[in-house]
């Protein structure tokens, strides 16, 4: 994911226990990892800006059969005040990058992180 | 290995200012808060205030009033705590102390603390 | 505020003991809970975080439980270097607060 440090309001900011909740969810996922996250697949990279949540649904949502991302689609689909369906692609996404899901996973931790700290001290 | 390092003792008399520094080593400053905690001679522990030191966002403990300053200084990965308008009362030892909220708690590193006397 | 009680704020106890420390938040504070042990003119060093988390090079004689407003520090088995003062901190929402402290000395 790039734009990491991006100061552009992340969209509709979810409250801070449902922030909070998701980022415990990717810790989860993170931690929890043995295997290649949801064997290795593939998504597209997207900026960290406005309309973040829709973004990284979008990207997440083409995975499937992977259940340790299945609650994490589920909150940022809580997130995005439009419906998101698989193929669908929104400006936000680096479409001349992939990475693995494991990746996108941590970046998305980090920069959620950032914005929960942010939130906390201001 | 994490490293949270205080300045030294001081002594300082009532109506003064106290500025207390905490050096930070071993990770990256910016990705976790920094708190501040107070402990008075035989008493408990007190949360003073916390920083973000990416934004330099702030919180702190309204039982100070305002006499709290918090700051990072992102180019020598310090955080300082100013405490002014001492009284005797501020006599104790003063620690920071931070971490990852996610991953430890935000209280998972501690310096080695700084005794503050406040006397006329 | 939160308010953090801590029970109890003292205790004898020997080596080989199981000890229980117990802590009640004035209301639920989402298991986001530490524990921590201090010794004299030492700085407070961490042991438990998320209520039931526990520190990397910790014991693991040491365990934590608890949810929503009421948790439990126990100690297994009492080990000589166990004796300190222990406290718990809810970190939920500001301002943090401390549980007052429970004393473990040597009975």
């Known amino acids: 994911l790039t734009c990491l440090g991006g100061f552009a309001s992340p969209g509709p900011v979810p409250p801070s226990t449902a922030l909070r909740e998701l980022i415990e969810e990717l810790v989860n996922i993170t931690q929890n990892q043995k295997a290649p996250l949801c064997n290795g697949s593939m998504v597209w990279s997207i900026n960290l800006t406005a309309g973040m949540y829709c973004a990284a649904l979008e990207s997440l949502i083409n995975v499937s059969g992977c259940s340790a991302i299945e609650k994490t689609q589920r909150m940022l689909s809580g997130f995005c005040p439009h419906k998101v369906s698989a193929g669908q692609f929104s400006s936000l996404h680096v479409r001349d990058t992939k990475i693995e899901v494991a990746q996108f996973v941590k970046d998305l931790l980090l920069h959620l992180k950032k914005l929960f700290r942010e939130g906390q001290f201001n | 290995e994490v490293q949270l390092v205080q300045s030294g003792a001081e002594v300082k008399k009532p109506g003064a200012t106290v500025k207390i520094s905490c050096k930070v080593s071993?990770?990256?400053?910016?990705?976790?808060?920094m708190h501040w905690v107070q402990q008075a001679p035989g008493k408990g522990l007190e949360w003073m205030g916390g920083i973000d030191p990416e934004t330099g966002g702030t919180a702190s403990n309204q039982k100070f009033k305002g006499r709290v300053t918090l700051t990072a200084d992102k180019s020598t990965d310090t955080a300082y705590m100013e405490l002014s308008s001492l009284r005797s009362e501020d006599t104790a030892v003063y620690y920071c102390?931070?971490?990852?909220?996610f991953g430890g708690g935000p209280f998972a590193y501690w310096g080695q603390g700084t005794l503050v006397t406040v006397s006329s | 505020d939160i308010q953090m009680t801590q029970s109890p704020s003292s205790l004898s106890a020997s080596v080989g003991d199981r000890v229980t420390i117990t802590c009640k938040a004035s209301q639920d504070i989402n298991s986001y809970l530490s524990w921590f042990q201090q010794k004299p003119g030492k700085a407070p060093k961490s042991l438990i975080y998320?209520?039931?988390r526990l520190v990397d090079g910790v014991p693991s004689r040491f365990s934590g439980s608890g949810s929503g407003t009421d948790f439990t520090l126990t100690i297994s088995s009492l080990q000589p270097e166990d004796f300190a003062t222990y406290y718990c901190?809810?970190?939920?929402?500001?301002?943090?607060?401390f549980g007052g402290g429970t004393k473990v000395e040597i009975k």
């Open positions: 998320r209520a039931n």
């Open positions: 071993g990770y990256t400053f910016t990705d976790y808060e």
């Open positions: 901190l809810q970190y939920d929402e500001f301002p943090y607060t």
């Open positions: 102390t931070s971490g990852d909220y």
